[in-house]
C-alpha cells in the first residue's frame, strides 16, 4: 500500500488517576498511609510529574490514500500510528505497588496497536477500468504492552500480540506480595 501521508492530530495515552490501583503518594490526600497499605513504598516517594509527558504512548493521526498498483482510493483514510515511550513502569496502569519496580531494571513496555478496524474503500483505476473494492485493516487505538520473553524476534520488531506467559516453576521467595501474584497482575493489566 502506498502512503501519501500528513499528520493531522496526536492523542497522548497517559494513565489517568482512575487507572492506578493506588494513586501516586503526592496525589493522595491522606498522607498517613503506612508501609503495609502503601505496598512497601515510603509515603512521600518522589514521583516527578514531568515523567508523565516524557513517557506517553501517543496516537498520531495520519491521513493517507490507499493504493493497489495503479489504482488509488477515491477518498483518503485516516488511521493511527502508535508512537512514544511507555516507561517507567511506575507510570503504567496497575504497575504501582504491584510490580517489583524498585529493581534497577524491569518489564519493558512498548506503545503498540491495541485495536484494529476494517474499512472498505473504493479504488479508482486509470484507463476506464472498473472501480475495485478493497477492505483495509487500520489501527484504531494504541496501548502500552509488555514485551515478553515468549515473543519471537519478528514479533519483537513489530511488537506483535502478547502470548500468555506461563509461570516458571520456582519456589516463591518470602515477600509481602508473591512474585507470581505480581507478575500475573502486571500482565493481566494489559
Amino acid at each position: 500500500q502506498g502512503w501519501q501521508a500528513f499528520k493531522n492530530d496526536a492523542t497522548e495515552i497517559i494513565p489517568e488517576l482512575g487507572e492506578y490501583p493506588e494513586p501516586p503518594p503526592e496525589l493522595e490526600n491522606n498522607k498517613t498511609m503506612n508501609r503495609a497499605e502503601n505496598g512497601g513504598r515510603p509515603p512521600h516517594h518522589p514521583f516527578e510529574t514531568k515523567d508523565v509527558s516524557e513517557y506517553s504512548c501517543r496516537e498520531l493521526h495520519f491521513t493517507r490514500y490507499v493504493t493497489d498498483g495503479p489504482c488509488r482510493s477515491a477518498k483518503p483514510v485516516t488511521e493511527l500510528v502508535c508512537s512514544g515511550q511507555c516507561g517507567p513502569a511506575r507510570l503504567l496502569p496497575n504497575a504501582i505497588g504491584r510490580g517489583k519496580w524498585w529493581r534497577p531494571s524491569g518489564p519493558d513496555f512498548r506503545c503498540i496497536p491495541d485495536r484494529y478496524r476494517a474499512q472498505r474503500v473504493q479504488l479508482l483505476c486509470p484507463g476506464g477500468e472498473a472501480p475495485r473494492a478493497r477492505k483495509v485493516r487500520l489501527v484504531a487505538s494504541c496501548k502500552c504492552k509488555r514485551l515478553t520473553r515468549f515473543h519471537n524476534q519478528s514479533e519483537l520488531k513489530d511488537f506483535g500480540t502478547e502470548a500468555a506467559r506461563p509461570q516458571k516453576g520456582r519456589k516463591p521467595r518470602p515477600r509481602a506480595r508473591s512474585a507470581k501474584a505480581n507478575q500475573a497482575e502486571l500482565e493481566n493489566a494489559y
Epitope: R35, H44, Q85, P88, R90, W101
Partner: antibody, heavy 119, light 110 residues
Framework: EVQLVESGGGLVQPGRSLRLSCAAS????????LHWVRQAPGKGLEWVSG????????DYADSVKGRFTISRDNSKNSLYLQMNSLRVEDTALYYC????????????WGQGTTVTVSS | QSVLTQPPSASGTPGQRVTISCSGS????????VNWYQQLPGTAPKLLIY???QRPSGVPDRFSGSKSGTSASLAISGLQSEDEADYYC???????????FGGGTKLTVL
C-alpha cells in the same frame, strides 16, 4: 550532596564473617531502593543483592544466597550486608548503590569498600 | 562468562562516533529494560542510560541508547578523551532472577 559511604571491608579468612555498612546522606533515604554490587580485581561488575522499601522486597544473586543477608535501617539512613561463610571468590570491591526511579538503573553509587578473603 | 555479551574493547578518535553492543536473551534484554553504566578509571560506576534510551540529568546528549529484540547498543558521538572508560550494560533476568551485567567494554580514545 547525594552520598553513599561504605565501610566494614577488610581482610578475613575463608569461612569467617564480615558486615558491611553503607551510610547515606544528602537525600531522603526512604525514597531509595538499595543494592550491593561487587567488582573483583580486574573484573567486571556483579550485582549481589537488592532491597526495596521494606524487608519483604529482597533479592540475592545465586552465588551469595544463603550466605549473605541484606538489610536496611531507615532510622539510621544505613544499608548493611552481613556476609557469612566467606569464600576466596568473594574477594572484591563492594559498592553500595541506589535507585529511586522505577526500573531506572542505579543512579547513586558509593566509592566502595574492599573485602579480601584469604588464608 | 557474563550473561550479557559485550565486546571487550572498542576504540575511536576524537570527534568520531562509536557504538558498543550488548547481546542478551529473551529472558533479560528481550523482555526487560536495559541500563548502561560508565566507569572511569579508579572510580565508581555512573549511570549513563536507563530504560533503554533515557539519559539521567547531567549526561550529555552525545550518549544515546537503543534496543532491538535481544540486543542493545550504546552510541557515543563526538568522542572525547574523557570518554575513555569501561562501559557496562545491565538488565534484569527473569529466569535467573537477578540483575545481570555485561562483561564490560573498555573504550580507548586514540
Amino acid at each position: 550532596e547525594v552520598q553513599l559511604v561504605e565501610s566494614g571491608g577488610g581482610l578475613v579468612q575463608p569461612g569467617r564473617s564480615l558486615r558491611l555498612s553503607c551510610a547515606a546522606s544528602g537525600f531522603t533515604f526512604e525514597d531509595y531502593a538499595l543494592h550491593w554490587v561487587r567488582q573483583a580485581p580486574g573484573k567486571g561488575l556483579e550485582w549481589v543483592s537488592g532491597i526495596g522499601w521494606n524487608d519483604d522486597e529482597i533479592d540475592y544473586a545465586d552465588s551469595v544466597k544463603g550466605r549473605f543477608t541484606i538489610s536496611r535501617d531507615n532510622s539510621k539512613n544505613s544499608l548493611y550486608l552481613q556476609m557469612n561463610s566467606l569464600r576466596v571468590e568473594d574477594t572484591a570491591l563492594y559498592y553500595c548503590a541506589g535507585n529511586n526511579r522505577g526500573y531506572g538503573g542505579l543512579d547513586v553509587w558509593g566509592q566502595g569498600t574492599t573485602v579480601t578473603v584469604s588464608s | 562468562q557474563s550473561v550479557l555479551t559485550q565486546p571487550p574493547s572498542a576504540s575511536g578518535t576524537p570527534g568520531q562516533r562509536v557504538t558498543i553492543s550488548c547481546s542478551g536473551s529473551s529472558s533479560n534484554i528481550g523482555s526487560n529494560t536495559v541500563n548502561w553504566y560508565q566507569q572511569l578509571p579508579g572510580t565508581a560506576p555512573k549511570l549513563l542510560i536507563y530504560s533503554n534510551n533515557q539519559r539521567p540529568s547531567g549526561v550529555p546528549d552525545r550518549f544515546s541508547g537503543s534496543k532491538s529484540g535481544t540486543s542493545a547498543s550504546l552510541a557515543i558521538s563526538g568522542l572525547q578523551s574523557e570518554d575513555e572508560a569501561d562501559y557496562y550494560c545491565a538488565a534484569w533476568d527473569d529466569e535467573l532472577e537477578l540483575y545481570v551485567f555485561g562483561g564490560g567494554t573498555k573504550l580507548t580514545v586514540l
